[in-house]
Each structure stands twice: as structure tokens, then as C-alpha cells.
């Protein structure tokens, strides 16, 4: 928008620095770290928010904790290397020249190794399975109360198309959210599942990255949904590849 | 069928205030935020604020900001707009409305209204 | 604090296809019919391009950017009204906003 008097905000990403120097004195935000022009009526991609967390201070929270169900995030935060689109660039490395390579929503799909290390392609992530475990209350939701709510939420929130929430399964106090989003079903212009799951993640943890209205307010007829525990497993359209001391 | 039905307008007194209340029907009124918008005469339609659909938030347009307060009884199905220190300007005919996008990161939008109440006319003048 | 702008006024023949714009805000823009002054307004469309039940189909919208645009295929005599555009105010405050509202006069 234009912004000749008013301070120039971003509300979909906090973690921007905006100023009205866009053609017409037109708002224009860019992502802090990266310094690449974002897109502030949409998500921000998963790549350039991790980047701009790790050029912010006092940030040493870790995603996700480890589990031997499927791909997870067992190596937490890194400061990742991102393509002129915002996506993950499929060979990451650290500082001390240590390489591997990513999926698309940047989880480790290989072992650790030197800069000889080659990653191909970066593999699509295509399905996210979010594992929730909600507070006690006093009895269980209603299924499809619960599954209408969190459709809602994905659809309206993080403009996620309905087709791509697969399932939303309910065992009390187990809530499990499928995503699902191939290659071939991605038009331009949709949300990619990988960042509506790291937007949901943050809401989630009290960490939103939306400016104005801010935190989540989940509720199934009313009643509060607040979530104490969140894991996230990735399935990738290819299979990760991990030497069999890591499976042991 | 929505029904959205404002009462509590008629003339008031400058630096007095208003209540006015919105009864709403033929929906369930919890899963929605709603909002008030008011148009003073001759002129176009002004956002006043917004309600989430639990109460837990409130937002407010810069003109009545410090002055307005909106509520909400879902067991009810009612919305209040409580407006002190009334001036000359707030004078116009005020709607409640029906917000379509609660969990919209932008939900405080005035282009996710959906459904209007017929109005309710304030006149503020001694 | 931000405004949307779009048109003062349109004029159509019947039959014709009316285009009115409104830019300005983020993606969430709404479109209001009001016949008279002081008339409750009527939601044509909502949420860029939803458009309500018992609103005839020759009502649409759609988004480019930053710009909503509301097209009336065919305009009829009854369409003859104001219409006001509904967006976001994203500067701090984050406040609903309304457009001055455009005349449609059917020739």
C-alpha cells in the first residue's frame, strides 16, 4: 500500500524491515537476514524466516524434538543458504564446511558431509504429518467439529487450498493433521504446505510471525483448543538417505 | 435466514454516552466476529471496530478509540457497542455486521463482512 | 491511516459489463451495495471474490495484486446504487477501511 505518512508494515511477517521506496511509494518489505523483497499479503517462505530468525537476537529454540517415526527435525535451527525464491537451496552448509542436504522445508535428508558432498535436487517434502496433544478438558471434542475447525484455521489463516488437508484424525488427546501437496499438485500462486506448517508451528508455541491480531484463537463450539506438545514428521517424495549407523 | 437487528439509537447528548445492541439470529453466533460500522449522513461507510468470536479481542478505528467499547454475550447471541463522550461527529446511523474470516490474519478486514443489520440512527446534540 | 481508493462514479448502459477497481490494502476486500443514504448496505462480495447466496451470479470479484476489481456482467436498472469497497489498514493499528464509495448510474 502506500505509505507517504504512515508507518509501512509487513502483517504477514514480523521479521522484516519495510519502507515506502517501492514504485508509487508503495510499502515494500524485506526479510531481515536475507534482505529479499517478500510478498506481505502471503506467507513468507520457511527458508527466509529461519534466516531472518538467525540474524535476530537472543533466538536458541529448537524446532522440534527428535522421534523415530519418520524424517523429523533433529538438528533444530541453522542459518540456511536460500535460493533467489525464497526455497531452500538443496546442499546446506556450516561455517566449519560440514554439508548436507535438504528437503524442501529444509530438514536434513542425509548424512553429514565435507563440501564434495552433491545434492541433485531438492526433494519435495509432500506429505507433513502435525502431531498434537491437546490440555485436558472436560471431555472430548467432537471429531468434526474438530476437523471443521483446523480446516478452517489452515484455509483462513494460512490461505492453505482445502484439498491440500488430507485428514484431520482424532484420538483423544491426540490430534494428527495430514498434509499432503505433490509436485504436480502445486499451481502457482498456492500456498506451499512445508510454510503453512512452520506459520502453524510458531502460532502454535505463542511465536506468531503475523503482526495485528497475532496469536491463534482455536476453539471447537467455544471451547479452548490449546495444544501442549506439537511434533512434526516430512515425508518426501523420495526417500531420505541415511547410512545404516544412523538407523541403529 | 441471518438476521442482525441494532436497537439503543435516537438522540443523545454531547459528552453523554450510548449503548446500543445488536440481537443476531438464523446462525451460530459464537463462530463468528462481528463488527460495527457506522455512516454519518451524506457521507460513506466508516469502520468503528471489531469483536473475535470469543470476546478475548477487541480492535478499535482511531475516531472512538479510548471511548468505544464492544462486547458480546454468545449465550445471548448479542453485541453491544458501548460509546462515551459522545461529540457531534458521532452522529450518523450505526450497523452491526458479520465478520466471514475469524482466523484471517487480516480478520479485522472490513471486506470479510458478509451480512448487515438494518441500522440503528444516532443523533448527538443538545 | 491508509485509504482505498476507487472510482467516484461509472455509468453503463444496460446489458454492459461494469468494472469498478479498488486498491490500496492487502488481500481481504469486500464490496457493498447501498441503494440510498442511510439504507443498510448489502454485501455483493466478500473475502475478494465470495459472493453471498441470494446475490445474482452476474456479480463477481477478483484480485490482481493489490487491486480488487468488481464486475457486474450485464448491469441492470436495479443495480443502479452506490458501492463501497471494504479492505485491511496494515499500518500499525490494523484497522478495517472502507473506499469513498462509487457511483454506478445505468444510462
Known amino acids: 500500500h502506500t505509505a507517504a505518512q504512515d508507518n509501512c508494515t509487513c502483517p504477514t511477517n514480523k521479521m522484516t524491515v519495510c519502507s515506502p521506496d517501492g514504485p508509487g511509494g508503495r510499502c515494500q518489505c524485506r526479510a531481515l537476514g536475507s534482505g529479499m523483497a517478500v510478498d506481505c499479503s502471503t506467507l513468507t517462505s520457511k527458508c527466509l524466516l529461519l534466516k531472518a530468525r538467525m540474524s535476530a537476537p537472543k533466538n536458541a529454540r529448537t524446532l522440534v524434538r527428535p522421534s523415530e517415526h519418520a524424517l523429523v527435525d533433529n538438528d533444530g535451527l541453522y542459518d540456511p543458504d536460500c535460493d533467489p525464491e525464497g526455497r531452500f537451496k538443496a546442499r546446506q552448509c556450516n561455517q566449519t564446511s560440514v554439508c548436507w542436504c535438504v528437503n524442501s522445508v529444509g530438514v536434513r535428508r542425509t548424512d553429514k558431509g565435507d563440501l564434495s558432498l552433491r545434492c541433485d535436487e531438492l526433494v519435495r517434502t509432500h506429505h507433513i504429518l502435525i502431531d498434537l496433544r491437546h490440555r485436558p478438558t472436560a471431555g472430548a471434542f467432537n471429531h468434526s467439529d474438530l476437523d471443521a475447525e483446523l480446516r478452517r484455521l489452515f484455509r483462513e489463516r494460512y490461505r492453505l487450498h482445502p484439498k491440500f488437508v488430507a485428514a484431520v484424525h482424532y484420538e483423544q488427546p491426540t490430534i494428527q493433521i495430514e498434509l499432503r501437496q505433490n509436485t504436480s499438485q502445486k499451481a502457482a500462486g498456492d500456498v506451499d504446505i512445508g510454510d503453512a506448517a512452520y506459520y502453524f508451528e510458531r502460532d502454535i508455541k505463542g511465536e506468531s510471525l503475523f503482526q495485528g491480531r497475532g496469536g491463534l484463537d482455536l476453539r471447537v463450539r467455544g471451547e479452548p483448543l490449546q495444544v501442549e506438545r506439537t511434533l512434526i514428521y516430512y515425508l518426501d517424495e523420495i526417500p531420505p538417505k541415511f547410512s545404516m549407523k544412523r538407523l541403529t | 435466514a441471518v438476521t442482525l437487528d441494532e436497537s439503543g439509537g435516537g438522540l443523545q447528548t454531547p459528552g453523554g454516552g450510548l449503548s446500543l445492541v445488536c440481537k443476531a439470529s438464523?446462525?451460530?453466533?459464537?463462530?463468528?466476529?462481528m463488527f460495527w460500522v457506522r455512516q454519518a449522513p451524506g457521507k460513506g461507510l466508516e469502520w468503528v471496530g471489531v469483536?473475535?468470536?470469543?470476546?478475548?479481542?477487541?480492535n478499535y478505528a482511531p475516531a472512538v478509540k479510548g471511548r468505544a467499547t464492544i462486547s458480546r454475550d454468545n449465550g445471548q447471541s448479542t453485541l453491544r457497542l458501548q460509546l462515551n463522550n459522545l461529540r457531534a461527529e458521532d452522529t450518523g446511523t450505526y450497523y452491526c455486521?458479520?465478520?466471514?474470516?475469524?482466523?484471517?490474519?487480516?480478520?479485522?478486514?472490513?471486506?470479510?463482512?458478509?451480512?448487515w443489520g438494518h441500522g440503528t440512527e444516532v443523533i448527538v446534540s443538545s | 491511516a491508509l485509504a482505498l481508493t476507487q472510482p467516484s462514479s461509472v455509468s453503463a448502459n444496460p446489458g454492459e459489463t461494469v468494472k469498478i477497481t479498488c486498491s490500496g490494502g492487502?488481500?481481504?476486500y469486500g464490496w457493498y451495495q447501498q441503494k440510498s443514504p442511510g439504507s443498510a448496505p448489502v454485501t455483493v462480495i466478500?473475502?475478494?471474490?465470495k459472493r453471498p447466496s441470494n446475490i445474482p451470479s452476474r456479480f463477481s470479484g477478483s484480485l490482481s495484486g493489490s487491486t480488487n476489481t468488481l464486475i457486474i456482467t450485464g448491469v441492470q436498472a436495479e443495480d443502479e446504487a452506490v458501492y463501497f469497497c471494504?479492505?485491511?489498514?496494515?499500518?500499525?493499528?490494523?484497522?478495517?477501511?472502507f473506499g469513498a464509495g462509487t457511483t454506478l448510474t445505468v444510462l
Open positions: 469483536i473475535n468470536r470469543s470476546g478475548s479481542y477487541t
Open positions: 438464523g446462525f451460530d453466533f459464537i463462530d463468528y466476529d
Open positions: 466478500y473475502w475478494n471474490d
Open positions: 471494504g479492505g485491511y489498514d496494515s499500518s500499525p493499528g490494523y484497522v478495517g477501511i
Open positions: 492487502y488481500s481481504g
Open positions: 455486521a458479520r465478520g466471514a474470516c475469524t482466523h484471517c490474519w487480516d480478520a479485522d478486514s472490513a471486506g470479510y463482512i458478509d451480512a
